[in-house]
Amino acid sequence: APLLLYANRRDLRLVDATNGKENATIVVGGLEDAAAVDFVFSHGLIYWSDVSEEAIKRTEFNKTESVQNVVVSGLLSPDGLACDWLGEKLYWTDSETNRIEVSNLDGSLRKVLFWQELDQPRAIALDPSSGFMYWTDWGEVPKIERAGMDGSSRFIIINSEIYWPNGLTLDYEEQKLYWADAKLNFIHKSNLDGTNRQAVVKGSLPHPFALTLFEDILYWTDWSTHSILACNKYTGEGLREIHSDIFSPMDIHAFSQQRQPNATNPCGIDNGGCSHLCLMSPVKPFYQCACPTGVKLLENGKTCKDGA
């Protein structure tokens, strides 16, 4: 069983999923309002968003006393965060600016990918090997959307029997999408295009918030029970509380290299020939050059206009 990394508003903690009744370890303490969290295992980096400080920050696994600001301007409520471990990019949602943005892992070369028809975007999940990203929106028209990680091919994949879609996670091996709905109190799954939808845990969960997966087990945080729960990803059976008495459980991830499988990085050689951003794409050549917001991409599709 994995270590589970979770945000707890005032700190980030790690707990062993097999021994969850034991105390967690504080990885980064003394925070204001940590909400979303993710990591790049191969780089030894942990990222989190702080919604009070309106910032995204990072630290190194083994140097957690040293915290770096990654994005500190233009954020209002960065509720969702995801690291592209292949393309080495950072993606985030902001439910107040109603944007989904991307940048390099250090926060440079920032680009707004989506800013229209977003109401309350929250969880975001990436599948860099296929070039797709997924996000939940619990606004007036709740939905789950999918798009290319380059901002292309945006499509609503779930928009029925959905109210407060909070948690979202991907099963890379089985090619499935899992999500938790805090109003309808369930966990459902579907194919990555939204077809073949099935219930995993039917309407019995008090207030599921964030969701992750490791091997055959789903793990999620619950706001009502202040705990981390788990069940079998196929059947929903074996539902149990594995870590309780959490101050304010927010985002959660299975903290393991297994959750960030290696694959061919189409941007790996010479940044794909791109002068600035090289973003994963679902269509050949499986990457797309892009420019920071406000800077134009030249007709060669590789170079950003001078002054970027």
Epitope: I26, V28, G30
Partner: antibody
Framework: QVQLQQSGPELVKPGASVRISCKAS????????IHWLKQRPGQGLEWIGW????????KYNAKFKGKATLTADKSSSTAYMQLSSLTSEDSAVYFC???????????WGQGSALTVSS | QIVLTQSPAIMSASPGEKVTISCSAN?????MFWYQQKPGSSPKPLIY???NLASGVPARFSGSGSGTSYSLTISSMEAEDAATYYC?????????FGGGTKLEI
């Protein structure tokens, strides 16, 4: 075993400053919050604030901002509280306490008595 | 800030008697903590997160409650339980304590 050893009693003049220490032993100092609390004679407890020694982030009760400054020295596993511009209202016993991972104060220092008098 | 009001302020109980101390918050809190303090000593944790017994605390102590109303119960008073008891919340900053209940034998 876990211990928090505080510095001894202090008698200081009004307007002066004082630094109280809290030396931790028996656990990993950098991975637990240290809180500071005030107790005036015959009265209840007041929470001053916390410090997380791992990255020395702090949080203060607004009432004590400008009065108390919390610091920590990782090399000696010691937390400090500096109190400035002292008045008779600051005369009290000050406690440091470790926050257990279930968010309560599981180990306390023995208390440091501060008397402010001319 | 959240104000915690303990009642009674002072009480006495005979050995073997059941004792209940109340703690009322001026707005709803998720959990309550209880500490025991004897004269000249540091406070000692009794109950965490409303109803969990801290390490080494005798089973005669228990906690309950929710929202704005919480209580600490000693099922059978013993001489060593004579002390001052404080409730505490961390629901919002600043973390606050009740004024204390002095329990005499």
């Amino acid at each position: 075993q876990v211990q928090l050893q505080q510095s001894g009693p202090e008698l200081v003049k009004p307007g002066a400053s004082v630094r109280i220490s809290c030396k931790a032993s028996g656990y990993t100092f950098t991975t637990y919050y240290i809180h500071w609390l005030k107790q005036r004679p015959g009265q209840g407890l007041e929470w001053i604030g916390w410090i997380f020694p791992g990255n020395v982030n702090t949080k203060y009760n607004a009432k004590f901002k400008g009065k108390a400054t919390l610091t920590a020295d990782k090399s000696s596993s010691t937390a400090y509280m500096q109190l400035s511009s002292l008045t008779s209202e600051d005369s009290a016993v000050y406690f440091c306490a470790r926050e257990e991972l279930q968010y309560y104060f599981d180990y306390w220092g023995q208390g440091s008595a501060l008397t402010v008098s001319s | 800030q959240i104000v915690l009001t303990q009642s009674p302020a002072i009480m006495s109980a005979s050995p073997g008697e059941k004792v209940t101390i109340s703690c009322s918050a001026n707005s709803s809190v998720r959990f309550m903590f209880w500490y025991q303090q004897k004269p000249g000593s540091s406070p000692k944790p009794l109950i965490y997160r409303t109803s969990n017994l801290a390490s080494g605390v005798p089973a005669r102590f228990s906690g309950s409650g929710s929202g704005t109303s919480y209580s600490l119960t000693i099922s059978s008073m013993e001489a060593e339980d004579a002390a001052t008891y404080y409730c505490q919340q961390y629901h919002s900053y600043p973390w606050t304590f009740g004024g204390g209940t002095k329990l005499e034998i």
